[in-house]
Interface confidence: low
């Protein structure tokens, strides 16, 4: 397993609608045709997988139908969008990139993007 550098922004603030977008860029050492991108969330020393997608270079990323992630790829950059975020989802979101094919296999893990999610304030005239 060979190491590969992955860059991602340090901090991103989610929109008031709970949507956060960031770019995950990897330094591909060769011409990969199949790439796997995984978003991991680290909070309280627990790491959980948020979503993952495999894509062929030049094609769109395909996440599960019920995934909270969407994304597009352009060269060695992946534009990731995570939606449906709440304040409790604030945490470090790590981008993991694997060059699945052809060999050799490369693995790169970014330092993570701290996503801050602020729940919207209730309307002044609401009952809350």
């Amino acid at each position: 397993c060979k190491a590969m550098h992955v860059a991602q922004p340090a901090v991103v603030l989610a929109s008031s609608r709970g949507i956060a977008s960031f770019v995950c860029e990897y330094a591909s050492p060769g011409k990969a045709t199949e790439v796997r991108v995984t978003v991991l969330r680290q909070a309280d020393s627990q790491v959980t997988e948020v979503c993952a997608a495999t894509y062929m270079m030049g094609n769109e990323l395909t996440f599960l139908d019920d995934s909270i992630c969407t994304g597009t790829s352009s060269g060695n950059q992946v534009n990731l969008t995570i939606q449906g975020l709440r304040a409790m989802d604030t945490g470090l979101y790590i981008c993991k990139v694997e060059l699945m094919y052809p060999p050799p296999y490369y693995l790169g893990i970014g330092n993570g993007t701290q996503i801050y999610v602020i729940d919207p304030e209730p309307c002044p005239d609401s009952d809350f």
Partner: antibody, heavy 124, light 110 residues
């Protein structure tokens, strides 16, 4: 030792659903992808789907899309396969299998540990 | 996506060598160097014999060897033994996190 132990045989009516479990022991379950493969009586092996180490990603064979759901519970080291809208041709032995490819990285693809199989019979 | 094509049956005498073939397409066997081979005795679970085209897991006899060229993979068993009588299946990675098995080959030791 490393093993996968599956739930017992099931008899179901057409149109029903079945959920088969596969409990892992002897290895670090959260690090491995898990497959489901089936084998109809007297037939060959047929790949159904795979689930990633923490369950965030699943891929199913086109033939089973919309009918199969693979899930896993890391707390009990168990992976599940649920097949809905059963028909007689779904009568088969269903196997879970561990993928050698480990999420910490590696270039080894092969199903190196298999469960004992679960016979699902669909009959009216 | 239909199964990979395997010879339906093959037979040999003890001590002989036999070869099982597995033919795929340019989107599975030919596209990826990720063919694995399994042996299955009647009413038993399959056992991994070969992975990544030619590698043997620890504990598998060196009588088993494999090779891939283009869209065809082959498994050779040398020094045939009675316990080799079983079904043999090839399997290939097919991209996008999907796999495909061969239809299976029945080996008879005469």
């Amino acid at each position: 030792q490393v093993q996968l132990v599956q739930s017992g045989a099931e008899v179901k009516k057409p149109g029903a659903s079945v959920k088969v479990s596969c409990k892992a022991s002897g290895f670090s379950f959260p690090n491995y992808y898990m497959h489901w493969v089936r084998q109809a009586p007297g037939q060959g092996l047929e790949w159904m789907g795979i689930i990633s180490p923490t369950g965030g990603s699943r891929t199913y064979a086109q033939k089973f899309q919309g009918r199969v759901t693979i899930t896993r519970d890391t707390s009990t080291s168990t992976v599940y396969m649920e097949l809905s809208s059963l028909r007689s041709e779904d009568t088969a032995v269903y196997y879970c299998a561990r993928e050698m490819y480990n999420w910490n990285g590696g270039w080894d693809y092969g199903m190196d540990v298999w469960g004992q199989g679960t016979l699902v019979t669909v009959s009216s | 996506q239909s199964a990979l094509t395997q010879s339906a049956s093959v037979s040999g005498f003890p001590g002989q060598s036999i070869t099982v073939s597995c033919v795929g397409t340019n989107s599975d066997v030919e596209a990826y160097d990720l063919v694995s081979w399994y042996r299955q005795h009647p009413d038993k679970s399959p056992n991994l014999l070969i992975y990544d085209n030619y590698k043997r897991p620890s504990g598998v006899s060196d009588r088993f060897s494999a090779f891939k060229s283009g869209n065809t993979a082959s498994l050779t068993i040398s020094g045939l033994q009675a316990e080799d009588e079983a079904y043999y299946y090839c399997c290939s990675y097919a991209g996008f996190s999907t796999w495909i098995f061969g239809a299976g080959t029945q080996l008879t030791v005469l």
